[in-house]
Interface confidence: low
């Protein structure tokens, strides 16, 4: 399956979303921190990132939960995480990022 990421809000700040199995979905903010945000931002070509909360509720799938990156990974898929779609979250817990060069 093709997987990619995007930020919803502005080009570098907003809700973190991932594309999986033909659908965009959100990331639950359980354990979401700066290490995870750095990896997410790296996937978009940025060198820095920080985790945001209260970025606005998304809709549809919540694809990822309990994302646990060290911060050194090249992609989120190398981080510990629940399997796709396995979560105990609502969209009020959607994770956000702010990326910078």
């Amino acid at each position: 399956n093709s997987v990619s990421v995007r930020i919803v809000g502005s080009s570098n700040r907003g809700r973190a979303e991932v594309y999986y199995s033909g659908t965009w979905g959100t990331i639950c903010d359980d354990e979401w921190d700066n290490s995870d945000a750095i990896v997410f931002c790296r996937m978009l070509g940025y060198s820095k990132g920080r985790a945001l909360s209260s970025v606005g509720a998304g809709t549809g799938q919540i694809w990822l939960d309990n994302v646990q990156c060290r911060g050194t990974e090249s992609t989120l898929w190398s981080c510990t995480k629940n399997s796709w779609g396995h979560h105990d979250c609502s969209h009020e817990e959607d994770a956000g990022v702010e990326c910078s060069v």
Epitope: E31, N66, Q68, E73, T75, S78, C79, T80, K81, S83
Partner: antibody, heavy 116, light 106 residues
């Protein structure tokens, strides 16, 4: 259901290399991290190292120079190799699935004795 | 490396007691702490994850609390089957287990 099972030699000579295999079922190695944890007789738990779902590895800094963890996804197996074994490496070796940082499923463990 | 200090090393309690086990860390670990139960001759079992979340299938008499550097595992009403060694474990920076608390029956 999720299962993990360790296998390997029960006895290893000092200075030799330990090779252990963890065979899993009920989940995909590409979606989860597999860690190795050991426990010397009568003592506590020590994290050894891990192989991430994306194939990256991470090792205990104290063991890193003698350690290698790899996997064969076609066989649903994770392989641990540790060289230059000494008597203090005698322990029960567990493989365990990691979920969000936590170890949610464990194998039953395999006892490894380092002795001549 | 983060240091984990569990106390007491050994705890004797009676069936029905409320039991509290302590884990202190050498630096802030942002709630990234679990509790594991290990019975003699068995693999460890996850009881509590991310400080205060009860793992599926674990009895509700077990609970976790804390933040920062001080964490607690509580057994509200001790049962005979709770005799075991309990380990705390942090995953905020590397992976480190505490030395364990051995829980015995009086």
């Amino acid at each position: 259901q999720v299962q993990l099972k360790e296998s390997g030699p029960g006895l290893v000579q000092p200075s030799q290399t330990l090779s252990l295999t963890c065979t899993v079922s009920g989940f995909s190695l590409t979606s989860y991290t597999l860690s190795w944890v050991r426990q010397p007789p009568g003592k506590g738990l020590e994290w050894i190292g891990a192989i991430w779902g994306g194939d990256n590895t991470d090792y205990n800094s104290a063991l890193k120079s003698r350690l290698s963890i790899s996997r064969d996804t076609s066989k649903s197996q994770v392989l641990l190799k540790m060289n230059s074994l000494q008597t203090e490496d005698t322990a029960i070796y567990f493989c365990t699935r990691e979920l969000g940082g936590s170890f949610d499923y464990w194998g039953q463990g395999v006892m490894v004795t380092v002795s001549s | 490396d983060i240091q984990m200090t569990q106390s007491p090393p050994v705890l004797s309690a009676s069936v029905g007691d409320r039991v509290t086990l302590s884990c202190k860390t050498s630096q802030n670990i942002n709630k990234k702490l679990d509790w594991y139960q290990q019975k003699h001759g068995e693999a460890p079992k996850l009881l509590i994850y991310y400080t205060n979340n009860l793992q599926t299938g674990i009895p509700s008499r077990f609970s976790g609390s804390g933040s920062g550097t001080d964490f607690t595992l509580t057994i509200s009403t001790l049962q005979p089957e709770d005799v075991a060694t309990y380990y705390c474990y942090q995953y905020d920076s590397g992976f480190t287990f505490g030395a364990g608390t051995k829980l015995e029956l009086k």
